[in-house]
Each structure stands twice: as C-alpha cells, then as structure tokens.
Amino acid sequence: MMTGTIETTGNISAEKGGSIILQCHLSSTTAQVTQVNWEQQDQLLAICNADLGWHISPSFKDRVAPGPGLGLTLQSLTVNDTGEYFCIYHTYPDGTYTGRIFLEVLESSVAEHGARFQIP
C-alpha cells in the first residue's frame, strides 16, 4: 500500500531571465527513493539516480543545474518555460509517486511564490 505524499513548492512565479528551484519532498513513507525524474509536459529535463548520479537532457544542459538535493535549478528563464513540471519519485517497494509544480514566468519584476500544497 502506498502511504507516501509528495510535497511540492506548488504554484510559483519567477522573473524572465531569472532562475528558480524546483523542489519536491516525499514524506509519510519508509520507502527508499531510488530515482527522481523531472519532466515538463512530455519532455524529460533531468534524472537523479541515487547510485548513478545525474542525467541532464541535452536540450536543457545549458539552463538546468542539478540540485539542490533531488531538486532542479532552472536558469535563464523565458516566458516559454511557463507550464507544469512534474517530479516523479521512483521508490522501493512502494512504486512511483508524482508531484506537480506550476511555474509562471513573468515579464514584470514582481514575482511571488505561491503556497505549498500536497499531492497524495
């Protein structure tokens, strides 16, 4: 039975040209996290495997930095980066947990972080 929950940074906004940290956290389970995949719609941004380290998709290699931790730093933001991002936690023995973050990249200089929320 999967008992864990993914806590994410929820809905966030950031300025064009700036950077943002995408972060998820798995709680309420003793399952071992073996890998975290970061995806935007149907496109893979990065993989962090507990043993093998990081894979960064070539199309993002100049704008994505591993970490902090299992998170992902997205740099040189453009308006086209607005959209849904998913952290997919591969765990043993539970299986897969998915968290969602919505990023809005703003033209203006005012960008505030949204509230944290949980996805079961």
């Epitope: 893979l44 993989i47 043993d51 998709s57 199309s59």
Partner: antibody
Framework: EVQLVQSGAEVKKPGSSVKVSCKTS????????IHWVRQAPGQGLEWIGG????????IYNQIFRGRATLTVDKSTSTAYMELSSLRSEDTAVYFC????????????WGQGTTVTVSS | DIQMTQSPSSLSASVGDRVTITCKAS??????VVWYQQKPGKAPKLLIY???YRFTGVPSRFSGSGSGTDFTLTISSLQPEDFATYYC?????????FGGGTKVEIK
C-alpha cells in the same frame, strides 16, 4: 584517447565464479559511471548494472542481484565484474562501458570478454 | 521492467536506401532513449541519444526522433559501412533495458 581494455576469455565450470576486469585510461576515472552489459551468443544486449566511482554507488539489474558484484580499484582506474554460481545460460560476451558525463548514455565500450560456462 | 520492442527484427536494403527502424516502449519513457550500432564480433557503438542527438563523429545520415513510447532511427541514405545490428535502449527507469535488435542486411 578514452580506452577500456578488458581481460581475456574465460572457460568456467557450472557453479563456479568468474571475475572480469576492465582497465580504463584517457579520462578521469571517478567522473564517469562504469556499466556492465552482456550478450549471449546470437542474442541481444542485457544490462547487468553500474558502479559510480565518485561515491561508490552500485546498482544492479534485479535478475543479477546476489550473483553479480561490481567493484573498482581507483588506484589503477580498473573496474571489475564478478559473477558467481555460474550456469550454462551465463555463457556470453561481457562488456564494460562508460557512461557519458551527466548523460545516461554509454559512450565508450570495452572490446568484450567471452565467458564460456561448460562442464 | 520496461520492455523495448524493435521492428522489424531484420531487413534487407540496398546502398542508398532510406531505412527506418522503430522502437516501442511498454510504458512512458519520455525522451530517455539511446540507439547503438553493433557489427559482428565488435562492441556496440553509441549513435544517438535523448533521442535525437548524434554522438561525436556519427554521420548526419543517422537521425533519431520520438517521445513517450514511440521512437524511430532513420538512416537517410544507407552506406556499405551501415550494415549492422541496431539496438534501442531506455534509461527512464532501472533496470535499463534494450530492444531485441534490428539487423540491417544487404539486399
């Protein structure tokens, strides 16, 4: 020039063990994961597992867990794959291969080591 | 485990032909797919990764595409040195798995 040079062919009895070595050169050993892949005669490729010399992380394909052991000697930039409790189905060519940096793609390969298991 | 199914398993073609090999994943693998070329008695060689980037030194006649579950390797104009077996591989989740291979033979 990146090179991975493997040890020579082995003939083993069922139930015994084999240890294949993979001597690397031409790059910083601790910056790249070493994977092991095997190929039975006339068959496709099968991933055994990988070893990350940067933090000694080891990952195995579940079907080899408990029989395969991946190790490295950082002082000689050499990787090793030991397979125990050998059976005839383990007859194959065993390849060591390096993963590209920040990419889960195997960019350089050893020449392969033929392991024959026969009574 | 994720199964990678390649088709066809073999094909016959002539020099200059356009060749297309497909690879279907049993579940979503995003764009975490790699293609290798292997000649008899030799180790595989990295061709394409992620899944449309050519590895260093790979001729431009080789191209890859796809996302999700369906992937394609295309050789735009087959050359004599391209007769070999081609394998797809996914690294979306462990264990990493390979397709069964496609053998490209001379017609």
């Amino acid at each position: 020039e990146v090179q991975l040079v493997q040890s020579g062919a082995e003939v083993k009895k069922p139930g015994s063990s084999v240890k294949v070595s993979c001597k690397t050169s031409g790059y910083t050993f601790t910056e790249h994961v070493i994977h092991w892949v095997r190929q039975a005669p006339g068959q496709g490729l099968e991933w055994i597992g990988g070893f990350n010399p940067n933090h000694d992380g080891t990952i195995y394909n579940q079907i080899f867990r408990g029989r395969a052991t991946l190790t490295v000697d950082k002082s000689t930039s050499t990787a090793y794959m030991e397979l125990s409790s050998l059976r005839s189905e383990d007859t194959a060519v065993y390849f060591c291969t390096r993963a590209a940096k920040l990419l889960f793609a195997m960019d350089y390969w050893g020449q392969g080591t033929t392991v024959t298991v026969s009574s | 485990d994720i199964q990678m199914t390649q088709s066809p398993s073999s094909l016959s073609a002539s020099v200059g032909d356009r060749v297309t090999i497909t690879c279907k994943a049993s579940q979503h693998v995003s764009n975490a797919v790699v293609w290798y070329q292997q000649k008899p008695g030799k180790a595989p060689k990295l061709l394409i990764y992620s899944p449309s980037y050519r590895f260093t030194g790979v001729p431009s006649r080789f191209s890859g595409s796809g996302s999700g579950t369906d992937f394609t390797l295309t050789i735009s104009s087959l050359q004599p040195e391209d007769f070999a077996t081609y394998y797809c591989q996914q690294h979306y989740s462990t264990p990493w798995t390979f397709g069964g291979g496609t053998k490209v033979e001379i017609k």
